[in-house]
Interface confidence: low
C-alpha cells in the first residue's frame, strides 16, 4: 500500500507581506517564509515574531498558521519636561511614519538638540530627523528681564519684579548671592561658599523673590559645590568662582529666569565705560543688609587704572589679576558691598537683546563705594570652558 503526500495549499501572503520562495506548488517538506514590508512586523496573534517559516506536512497542511504583517507602532510618545507633544499625522496616530512635533513652553523655554520633529521608524522608535531616539531638551531661555536697557548711572535703586529674575539668595553661614544658570545651576563666588564645599546640603538657596526676609520664595537645595581649582582661600581672590548644582530643576517663569553666559563677542559690550548692573541684598549706605533687592548701574573701569588703585597698601601687589574686571565711579558712592558677594554683574547684549553675566561680585575696598576705589569682579568670560566642562560632566 502506498500513498502520495498531498501538496499544501498555495500560501497567500498577508497584506504588506510577501512569500519567499514563490513556487508553482509546495509539497512535503517544502517551506516558505513570510517577509513584511519596511515598517511592518510579523505578528502571530498578538505576539511579535523575529521570523516566520512554515513547512508542508504529509497530510497537505502547513505546520503553522499564516502570520500577519502588522504596521509598526511606536506607542504614545514620552512627555517632554517643560514642553508638549502634538500629533501631526492625526490624533493619536503612532504607527510607522507617523509624525509628532515636540515644542517647548513659549517665552521661557527653547528647544535644544533638534527641531522637535520625530517620525515613527521601522524599528519602533520615535526618531528625530538627525536620527536621535532620545527626547529633545527644553532649555530655559536666558537673560530675559523686565528692564529693557542698561540705562544711565544711578545707584541704590529698588528692583522691581522681573528685573533680576536670575538673582539667587544664598544663606548658610553668611548672606551671599548667586545667579541662576540654566535651570539647575547657580554661578557664584568661591569665597562665598568655600566653607560649604564639603557640606553642600547646608546651603539654603532662595529665588523668585525681591524681599530678603519674605516667606514667599522658591526654595532650592544644593547637591554639590564646585570651587575653581585655582582659588586659594585667604590668599587673594584670583579664580573667585564657583558653581552650585541644584538637586532639582527649578520651574522657569517671569520671576525665575537664568542669566546668559557671555558669548565670544561679549567683550564688545564690556569695554571701559560700558555700563553693567550689579544687584543684591548686601550692605547699603546705612550699613545694614537691604530688605529689598537693590541694584546699581556702574561703568567698567580701565583695567590699568583699577590695578593701580589696588597697588598701594594695604593691598598686596598683584591683587588685581587678568581674571578680574573692575567697575564703579571714580567719585565713589556706587558699588556692590558685603552680602552682595557671588551676585552677577550683568550687561545687555544689544545684538541678542539678552542680559549676560560679565562679572561675579568678588571683593573691593574695606569701605564700599570709596572714592578712587572700585568694585572688583571675577571676569566670567575667562571661565567659560571651566563652567561648560563642569556642567556637561555633572
Amino acid at each position: 500500500y502506498t500513498s502520495t503526500a498531498q501538496p499544501c495549499p498555495y500560501p497567500m501572503a498577508p497584506p504588506n507581506g510577501h512569500v519567499s520562495p514563490v513556487q508553482a506548488k509546495y509539497i512535503l517538506k517544502d517551506s516558505f517564509s513570510i517577509f513584511c514590508e519596511t515598517g511592518y512586523e510579523l505578528l502571530q496573534g498578538h505576539l511579535p515574531l523575529k521570523s516566520f517559516t512554515a513547512v508542508c506536512q504529509k497530510d497537505g497542511s502547513w505546520d503553522r498558521p499564516m502570520p500577519a504583517c502588522s504596521i509598526v507602532d511606536c506607542g504614545p510618545p514620552d512627555d517632554l519636561p517643560s514642553g508638549r507633544v502634538e500629533y501631526i499625522t492625526g490624533p493619536g496616530v503612532t504607527t510607522y511614519k507617523a509624525v509628532i512635533q515636540y515644542s517647548c513652553e513659549e517665552t521661557f523655554y527653547t528647544m535644544k538638540v533638534n527641531d522637535g520633529k520625530y517620525v515613527c521608524e521601522a524599528d519602533g522608535f520615535w526618531t528625530s530627523s538627525k536620527g536621535e531616539k532620545s527626547l529633545p531638551v527644553c532649555e530655559p531661555v536666558c537673560g530675559l528681564s523686565a528692564r529693557t536697557t542698561g540705562g544711565r548711572i544711578y545707584g541704590g535703586q529698588k528692583a522691581k519684579p522681573g528685573d533680576f529674575p536670575w538673582q539667587v539668595l544664598i544663606l548658610g553661614g553668611t548672606t551671599a548671592a548667586g545667579a541662576l544658570l540654566y535651570d539647575n545651576w547657580v554661578l557664584t563666588a568661591a569665597h562665598a561658599v568655600y566653607e560649604q564645599k564639603h557640606d553642600a546640603s547646608a546651603l539654603d538657596i532662595r529665588m523668585g523673590t525681591l524681599k530678603r526676609l519674605s516667606p514667599h520664595y522658591t526654595q532650592a537645595w544644593s547637591e554639590a559645590v564646585f570651587i575653581h581649582e585655582g582659588y586659594t582661600h585667604d590668599a587673594g581672590f584670583d579664580n573667585d568662582i564657583a558653581l552650585i548644582k541644584l538637586n532639582n530643576k527649578v520651574v522657569i517663569n517671569s520671576n525665575i529666569t537664568p542669566i546668559c553666559l557671555p558669548r565670544k563677542e561679549a567683550e564688545s559690550f564690556m569695554r571701559t565705560d560700558d555700563i553693567g548692573t550689579a544687584s543684591g541684598w548686601g550692605l547699603t549706605q546705612r550699613g545694614f543688609l537691604a530688605r529689598n533687592l537693590m541694584y546699581v548701574d556702574i561703568p567698567i573701569v580701565d583695567h590699568q587704572k583699577c590695578t593701580a588703585a589696588y597697588e598701594k597698601p594695604p593691598y598686596p601687589r598683584g591683587s588685581v589679576t587678568a581674571n578680574m574686571l573692575c567697575a564703579g565711579l571714580e567719585s565713589g558712592g556706587k558699588d556692590s558691598c558685603r552680602g552682595d558677594s557671588g551676585g552677577a554683574l550683568v550687561f545687555l547684549d544689544s545684538e541678542t537683546e539678552r542680559w549676560f553675566v560679565g562679572g561675579i561680585v568678588s571683593w573691593g575696598s574695606m569701605n564700599c563705594g570709596e572714592a578712587g576705589q572700585y568694585g572688583v569682579y571675577t571676569k566670567v568670560i575667562n571661565y567659560i570652558p571651566w563652567i561648560e566642562n563642569i556642567i556637561s560632566d555633572f
Epitope: P15, N16, E37, T38, T89, K97
Partner: antibody, heavy 120, light 113 residues
C-alpha cells in the same frame, strides 16, 4: 486644502531624460507617500512606484526599475520623478497622487497629470 | 503580481438605468485577520484625473453620491450605479492595495446612449 500641482507637458527626443515635478500643499508633506501612476491611451493605469518625502524610502514596480527615479525636496514640498532613456513606450500622461495613510494605499488626491511625448 | 481583470471593457446605457461592472483579482484580496477586502474603485472622466469612489471594496468616499455602491469579496467585486446620470460618463477602474505592486484593472468605459 490638499493640492498636488504638476509641471507642464514635455516633448522629448528618444534617449533623453525628463524630470516631472509634483508640488504638494495643504498637508505635512513628509508624512505621506507620494505615488506615481502612468496612463497610456488604451493601457489604463499603471502604478510606477512611490516615495516617502523626508526619508530614503521608495518602492518601485519591478517593471519601472531603472526607468523611473523618485526624489523629493522637503524644503519646497515638491516630489520629482525622472524618466531616463526615453522611448515611444514612455509617451503617456503621468500622475502623482497621495496615499491616504501609511496602511491605506488608495489614492484620494491626484495631480492634474503631466503629458510626456517622446518623438524624434 | 496580482492581476486585476475588469469586464465589460465598455458598455452603453441610458440615463436612469442601473449599471453593474465587474472586477476580478488573480488572488483573494480578503484578509482574514480583519475581514477587509483591499480593493478601491476610481472614476475618471474625460480629460480629468481619476477620482476615488470606493475603498475597502464597499466604503463610499465622502462626497460620493449614494447611487454608487461597491460589493463583493475575495476575488470577485462589483461596482453598481443604481440610476445612471449623464455626468457619470467616465472610465471606471478597480485597484488592489493588498501587496506591492498595487495594480489597476484595465477599466470599464461607461457611455451614455
Amino acid at each position: 486644502q490638499v493640492q498636488l500641482q504638476q509641471s507642464g507637458a514635455e516633448l522629448m527626443k528618444p534617449g533623453a531624460s525628463v524630470k516631472i515635478s509634483c508640488k504638494a500643499t495643504g498637508y505635512p508633506f513628509s508624512t505621506y507617500w507620494i505615488e506615481w501612476v502612468k496612463q497610456r491611451p488604451g493601457h489604463g493605469l499603471e502604478w510606477i512606484g512611490e516615495i516617502l518625502p523626508g526619508s530614503d524610502n521608495t518602492n518601485y514596480n519591478e517593471k519601472f526599475k531603472g526607468k523611473a527615479t523618485f526624489t523629493a525636496d522637503t524644503s519646497s514640498n515638491t516630489a520629482y520623478m525622472q524618466l531616463s532613456s526615453l522611448t515611444s513606450e514612455d509617451s503617456a500622461v503621468y500622475y502623482c497622487a497621495r496615499r491616504t495613510t501609511a496602511t491605506r494605499a488608495w489614492f484620494v488626491y491626484w495631480g492634474q497629470g503631466t503629458l510626456v511625448t517622446v518623438s524624434a | 503580481d496580482i492581476v486585476m481583470s475588469q469586464s465589460p471593457s465598455s458598455l452603453a446605457v441610458s440615463v436612469g438605468e442601473k449599471v453593474t461592472m465587474s472586477c476580478k483579482s488573480s488572488q483573494s484580496l480578503l484578509y482574514s485577520s480583519n475581514q477587509k477586502n483591499y480593493l478601491a474603485w476610481y472614476q475618471q472622466k474625460p480629460g480629468q484625473s481619476p477620482k476615488l469612489l470606493i475603498y475597502w471594496a464597499s466604503t463610499r468616499e465622502s462626497g460620493v453620491p449614494d447611487r454608487f455602491t461597491g460589493s463583493g469579496s475575495g476575488t470577485d467585486f462589483t461596482l453598481t450605479i443604481s440610476s445612471v446620470r449623464a455626468e457619470d460618463l467616465a472610465v471606471y477602474y478597480c485597484q488592489h492595495y493588498y501587496t506591492y505592486p498595487w495594480t489597476f484593472g484595465g477599466g470599464t468605459n461607461l457611455e451614455i446612449k
